[in-house]
C-alpha cells in the first residue's frame, strides 16, 4: 500500500504518510534572563522555559543552550513574540533647536545556525523604532513565518536589549516552532 | 494496518493517521459590541461573528457566547488580531514640571477556560503602552502561538477597553484556532 | 482500505489522506519595488522574491505578477510582514494652538482576486496611525490568519505607500500562505 | 437591560449653570465611554462631549470647551453635566448617550429639557 | 471640524417605496459612519454604524452603503413607522458631527 494512493488525482508523487500528533513541536516562554557573555556584534539570544507552565517541546524537539534542535528536516512554522519595556527614550524630548535625536530601537530576530555553514541566518526581523512621549512604554514584536529547514538547523530568538525584554509573564514573551 | 507503517524508520509510535480536511478549524471576525455587564477584575470578552463574510467555524469547533469550544484535544494553532483606535491620551500631553504622566495601553489576552480548572489561563498577552501625539490613533495588536488543549476547552479573547475596538470591518479584528 | 479507517469514533466522514509534505507552500521575501502605474483608488501591491534566499514557492503554488496563485481548494495560513520606514510626519509636530494635526498612517492589506467575482475581497488588514516624535521611524505590521480558498483564487499584498516599504532585507518585508 | 435615566426638565435664568444628571444601569458603567449630545428645538444634534467614567478622563467639543464640566461617580453609576455660564439658544434637550465603542450612540436616555429664560 | 451634509432635507414617500439617504462628509472617514432614526418628541435610535452594518434588531429593509466622503441609507420597502427624521453622524475624529437630518414623510 502506498502513501499515493490517497493522492488527488493530479499528483503522482508522494512522500510517505504520517500521523500529525508526532510532528516535532515546541513552545518556549520566557524565563528571567541571567547577565551572560554576549558574541561581539550580534545581539544577545534569549533563554527559554521549555517544560513548565505553557511550555513544551515533544516529538524530538529539543531545546538546549537558548536553541531549538530541528530534529528532521522539512517545512516548519516559527514564531516568537518579545514584549518590551522601558523608560522614555531621549528622542522623545521635544526637537532641540531643530536638530532632531536619533531614535532608540528595540529588535527581535529570529536565526538559524546550520553547523555546517559558517555564518548564522537571519529569517524573521521585527524592529521598532522608539520614541514615546510619557514615562515608561511597553509594546510586543511578533513574528511568525514558514522556513525549509535541515535536520541538525539550530534555532535562537536574538534581542536587540535583553534588559528591556519583560519576563514577567508566559504569555507576553514566547518562541516555538512546529513541523507542518 | 497500523498507521505506523508509514512512519520514518526512527519513529515507533505513532497515533492514527486522519485527513487534515476534517480538522477543527474557526476564523472569527468582529461585529459590534453592545454595552454590557463585566465580570469584575477581568478584561470584557469580545463576542463573534462566525458564519457571515469570512467567519467560519467547521468540524465540529463551535462558536457560542464568546467562546470557541475544542471539539477533540490536540495541539491547536490559535491566533487573534484586535485592531483599537482612541482618541490621544493624556500622557501625549508634554510632560508638565518634569513630571511623566502614567501612559494609557491597550491589552488583548487570549484566555483559556477549563471547567475543572477553577481559574482562566492567560495562553497570550499583546499590550502596548499608548502615547500618541495628534488627534485620533490607530493601531493593531496580533497574536499567534500554538497550545495543547483539551476537549471542551474554552478560548475567548479579552480586551482592556472594549469601546476602542474598530468593529468596522472583519479584515481589522478577528480570532481564530485550527488542529496542527 | 478507506482514509475514514483512521479516523476518531466520533467521525464519520474523511477527505482522502494525503501527505504534509506534498501541500501547496509559499514564503515570498521582499524586493526593491520600481515604479509602477497604481489603480486609482487601491492601495498599490508589492512585488516579491519566490526563489532566492529563504524565499521558495513548492507543490503547485506559483508566483507571478504580484499575485500567489491557489492551485487547490482548502484552508490556507496566510501572513504578511511589511517593515516602514519614514521621516517624521507633520503630526509629530507638537499640537499647534490645541489643534491636533490628522495623524499620517501606515496599512498592510493582504487582498484576494478571484476571477469570477468582480471586486477584491480584503482577507486581513493591518493599520497604524505613525505620529512619531523624532527623526526617522521604523516599524513592521505582521498579519496572519486562515482562509477557505478556492483553486484559481489569487493572493497579494498592499500597502498605503509603497515608497515606505523597507526593501533592504528578506528578514523584514515577507509573504507566505500554506495549506493546512 | 441597558438603560439610562436622566433628571427631570429645568429652567434657569441667563448666566445660571444647570447640571443634568443620568444614571446608568444594565451594564457595567465604566467600561464605555458616555456622551451627551443636545438638540435645539426643531434642530438636529450636536456632540458636547464624553467622559471615560473608570478614569474621569474627559473630551469637550470646542464649541462648549470652559464651560462644560462632566463628571461622574462610579458608586451610584451615574454622570453628569453641567454647563455654566447659559444663554437663550442653549435652549435644548440634553441627552446622555452610551456606545458599545466610543465613536457612537447605542443607547439614549428619554433626555431632559433645558430652558433658559429671564 | 468635519462637516456633514445631509441631502434632500426632506421627502415625500409612500408605504412600500424605497427610499435613498444621502450623506457627504467634508474630508473622508474612512467608514466610520452611524446612522440614526429620530421619532418626533423621542430620543434617536441607532441603525448602522461601520457604514453599512446593520445594528442588532434593526429590520433588514434597512442598508447602508459608502466609504470615504460618500454615504448612502437606503430603506427598502418603507413601513408606516419608518416615518422619522434621520441623521448620519461620523466618528471618524472629535469632535464627532451629525448631518443636519434627512424629515421622511407620508406623501
Known amino acids: 500500500l502506498k502513501g499515493q494512493e490517497f493522492a488527488p488525482s493530479h499528483q503522482q508523487v508522494y512522500a510517505p504518510l504520517r500521523a500529525d500528533g508526532d510532528k516535532p513541536r515546541a513552545h518556549l516562554t520566557v524565563v528571567r534572563q541571567t547577565p551572560t557573555q554576549h558574541f561581539k556584534n550580534q545581539f544577545p539570544a534569549l533563554h527559554w522555559e521549555h517544560e513548565l507552565g505553557l511550555a513544551f517541546t515533544k516529538n524530538r524537539m529539543n531545546y538546549t543552550n537558548k536553541f531549538l534542535l530541528i530534529p528532521e528536516s522539512g517545512d516548519y512554522f516559527i514564531y516568537s513574540q518579545v514584549t518590551f519595556r522601558g523608560m522614555t527614550s531621549e528622542c522623545s524630548e521635544i526637537r532641540q533647536a531643530g536638530r532632531p535625536n536619533k531614535p532608540d530601537s528595540i529588535t527581535v530576530v529570529i536565526t538559524k545556525v546550520t553547523d555546517s555553514y559558517p555564518e548564522p541566518t537571519q529569517l524573521l526581523m521585527g524592529t521598532k523604532s522608539v520614541c514615546e512621549v510619557g514615562s515608561n512604554w511597553f509594546q510586543p514584536i511578533y513574528l511568525g513565518a514558514m522556513f525549509s529547514l535541515q535536520e541538525g538547523d539550530k534555532l535562537m530568538v536574538n534581542v536587540s536589549d535583553i534588559s528591556l525584554v519583560d519576563y514577567t509573564k508566559e504569555d507576553k514573551t514566547f518562541f516555538g516552532a512546529f513541523l507542518l | 494496518l497500523k498507521g505506523q507503517e508509514f512512519a520514518p524508520s526512527h519513529q515507533q509510535v505513532y497515533a492514527p493517521l486522519r485527513a487534515d480536511g476534517d480538522k477543527p478549524r474557526a476564523h472569527l471576525t468582529v461585529v459590534r459590541q453592545t454595552p454590557t455587564q463585566h465580570f469584575k477584575n477581568q478584561f470584557p470578552a469580545l463576542h463573534w461573528e462566525h458564519e457571515l463574510g469570512l467567519a467560519f467555524t467547521k468540524n465540529r469547533m463551535n462558536y457560542t457566547n464568546k467562546f470557541l469550544l475544542i471539539p477533540e484535544s490536540g495541539d491547536y494553532f490559535i491566533y487573534s488580531q484586535v485592531t483599537f483606535r482612541g482618541m490621544t491620551s493624556e500622557c501625549s500631553e508634554i510632560r508638565q514640571a518634569g513630571r511623566p504622566n502614567k501612559p494609557d495601553s491597550i491589552t488583548v489576552v487570549i484566555t483559556k477556560v477549563t471547567d475543572s480548572y477553577p481559574e482562566p489561563t492567560q495562553l497570550l498577552m499583546g499590550t502596548k503602552s499608548v502615547c500618541e501625539v495628534g488627534s485620533n490613533w490607530f493601531q493593531p495588536i496580533y497574536l499567534g502561538a500554538m497550545f495543547s488543549l483539551q476537549e471542551g476547552d474554552k478560548l475567548m479573547v479579552n480586551v482592556s477597553d472594549i469601546s476602542l475596538v474598530d468593529y468596522t470591518k472583519e479584515d481589522k479584528t478577528f480570532f481564530g484556532a485550527f488542529l496542527l | 482500505l478507506k482514509g475514514q479507517e483512521f479516523a476518531p469514533s466520533h467521525q464519520q466522514v474523511y477527505a482522502p489522506l494525503r501527505a504534509d509534505g506534498d501541500k501547496p507552500r509559499a514564503h515570498l521575501t521582499v524586493v526593491r519595488q520600481t515604479p509602477t502605474q497604481h489603480f486609482k483608488n487601491q492601495f498599490p501591491a508589492l512585488h516579491w522574491e519566490h526563489e532566492l534566499g529563504l524565499a521558495f514557492t513548492k507543490n503547485r503554488m506559483n508566483y507571478t505578477n504580484k499575485f500567489l496563485l491557489i492551485p487547490e481548494s482548502g484552508d490556507y495560513f496566510i501572513y504578511s510582514q511589511v517593515t516602514f520606514r519614514g521621516m517624521t510626519s507633520e503630526c509629530s509636530e507638537i499640537r499647534q494652538a490645541g489643534r491636533p494635526n490628522k495623524p499620517d498612517s501606515i496599512t498592510v492589506v493582504i487582498t484576494k482576486v478571484t476571477d469570477s467575482y468582480p471586486e477584491p475581497t480584503q482577507l486581513l488588514m493591518g493599520t497604524k496611525s505613525v505620529c512619531e516624535v523624532g527623526s526617522n521611524w521604523f516599524q513592521p505590521i505582521y498579519l496572519g490568519a486562515m482562509f477557505s480558498l478556492q483553486e484559481g483564487d489569487k493572493l497579494m499584498v498592499n500597502v498605503s505607500d509603497i515608497s515606505l516599504v523597507d526593501y533592504t532585507k528578506e528578514d523584514k518585508t515577507f509573504f507566505g500562505a500554506f495549506l493546512l | 437591560e441597558v438603560q439610562l435615566v436622566e433628571s427631570g426638565a429645568e429652567v434657569k435664568n441667563p448666566g445660571a449653570s444647570v447640571k443634568v444628571s443620568c444614571k446608568a444601569s444594565?451594564?457595567?458603567?465604566?467600561?464605555?465611554?458616555l456622551h451627551w449630545v443636545r438638540q435645539a428645538p426643531g434642530q438636529g444634534l450636536e456632540w458636547m462631549g464624553w467622559i471615560k467614567p473608570n478614569s474621569g478622563g474627559t473630551n469637550y467639543a470646542q464649541k462648549f470647551q470652559g464651560r462644560v464640566t462632566m463628571t461622574r461617580d462610579t458608586s451610584i453609576s451615574t454622570a453628569y453635566m453641567e454647563l455654566s455660564r447659559l444663554r437663550s439658544d442653549d435652549t435644548a434637550v440634553y441627552y446622555c448617550?452610551?456606545?458599545?465603542?466610543?465613536?457612537?450612540?447605542?443607547?439614549w436616555g428619554q433626555g431632559t429639557m433645558v430652558t433658559v429664560s429671564s | 471640524d468635519i462637516v456633514m451634509t445631509q441631502s434632500p432635507s426632506s421627502l415625500s414617500a409612500s408605504v412600500g417605496d424605497r427610499v435613498t439617504i444621502t450623506c457627504r462628509a467634508s474630508?473622508?472617514?474612512?467608514?466610520?459612519l452611524n446612522w440614526y432614526q429620530q421619532q418626533p418628541g423621542k430620543a434617536p435610535k441607532f441603525l448602522i454604524y461601520?457604514?453599512?452594518r446593520l445594528q442588532s434588531g434593526v429590520p433588514s429593509r434597512f442598508s447602508g452603503s459608502g466609504s470615504g466622503t460618500d454615504f448612502t441609507l437606503t430603506i427598502n420597502s418603507l413601513q408606516p413607522e419608518d416615518f422619522a427624521t434621520y441623521f448620519c453622524?461620523?466618528?471618524?475624529?472629535?469632535?464627532?458631527?451629525f448631518g443636519p437630518g434627512t424629515k421622511v414623510e407620508i406623501k
Open positions: 461601520g457604514a453599512s
Open positions: 474630508q473622508s472617514i474612512s467608514s466610520y
Open positions: 448617550a452610551v456606545g458599545g465603542s466610543y465613536d457612537a450612540f447605542d443607547i
Open positions: 444594565g451594564y457595567t458603567f465604566t467600561g464605555y465611554y
Open positions: 453622524q461620523q466618528g471618524y475624529s472629535s469632535p464627532f458631527t
